[in-house]
Interface confidence: medium
């Protein structure tokens, strides 16, 4: 990969009620069909129009699903993960990882080897430093007046 995509990562608990046509989304991933290099996690690949997930509005395509009803999705075969969702019952609790892209570059996936994306302090420290420099420069300028 020539470059990378950086992410701010947040986690959320999403409780869905199974609708007439189910939960209303598709997944990719699993130990037998890694969707992201070096990451066998389960990702939301499609959200069906007017399905339970779409109507709830919080689950997004590209989200990583960490657990279903408290059951970890790590190291599962794709079909085993699918079966877990299908047998999850009427009320389904999903632990989800959202990734907000914060910097564009040549596209590359970030896998479990570096799961946290870009740490928040990596963004805040430069911003804070710039603010301090600007404040110092402003004070110096005022003293010269």
């Amino acid at each position: 990969m020539n470059g990378r995509v950086d992410y701010l990562v947040t986690e959320e608990e999403i409780n869905l009620t199974r609708g007439p046509s189910g939960l209303g989304f598709n997944i990719v991933g699993g130990t037998d069909q890694q969707y992201v290099s070096n990451d066998s996690g389960i990702y939301v690949s499609r959200i069906k129009e007017n399905g339970a997930a779409a109507l709830d509005g919080r689950l997004q395509e590209g989200d990583k699903i960490l657990s279903v009803n408290g059951q970890d999705l790590k190291n599962l075969l794709h079909q085993d993960a699918v079966d877990l969702f299908r047998n999850a019952g009427y009320a389904v609790s999903l632990r989800v990882q959202h990734r907000l892209q914060v910097q564009n570059g040549p596209i590359g996936h970030r896998g479990e080897g570096d799961p946290s994306g870009i740490p928040i302090f990596m963004v805040l420290v430069p911003v804070f430093a710039l603010t301090m420099v600007a404040a110092w420069a402003f004070m110096r300028y005022r003293q010269q007046l």
Partner: nanobody
């Protein structure tokens, strides 16, 4: 996007066999259903057979017991083995794919309008 390239069509005598192949440009892991449709001049395109990522298969009544659909994820290819061919099987055969992984709900029936990607078609003529 996924490009689909069909091959294997041709002219065959009644009672003969052909094997159609459809190669996808992207991994089949990201495709949740693939199908073969056929169309004859002046008629609507009709479903011949389909296979889901879960391995479920469905066939048109007219081809049951004669045609077999299968997929090879390693080669990103779906096949249609056609045996005991009849003159009425003459048509242009199209490969179709539905993107987006596997439904967490079921291997639901996939209608023609739900397919995202289509091949250019391959002619099968049974004399």
């Amino acid at each position: 996007d996924v490009q689909l390239v069909e091959s294997g069509g041709g002219l065959v005598q009644a009672g003969g066999s052909l094997r159609l192949s459809c190669a996808a440009s992207r991994t089949l892991f990201s495709i949740n259903a693939m199908a073969w449709y056929r169309q004859t001049p002046g008629k609507q395109r009709e479903l011949v057979a389909r296979v889901t990522s879960g391995g479920s298969t469905n066939y048109a009544d007219s081809v049951k017991g004669r045609f077999t659909i299968s997929r090879d994820n390693a080669k990103n290819t779906v096949y249609l083995q056609m045996n005991s061919l009849k003159p009425e099987d003459t048509a242009v055969y199209y490969c179709a794919a539905r993107g987006g992984g596997t439904s967490v709900d079921s291997d639901y029936d996939v209608e023609e309008f739900e397919y995202d990607y289509w091949g250019q078609g391959t002619q099968v003529t049974v004399s």
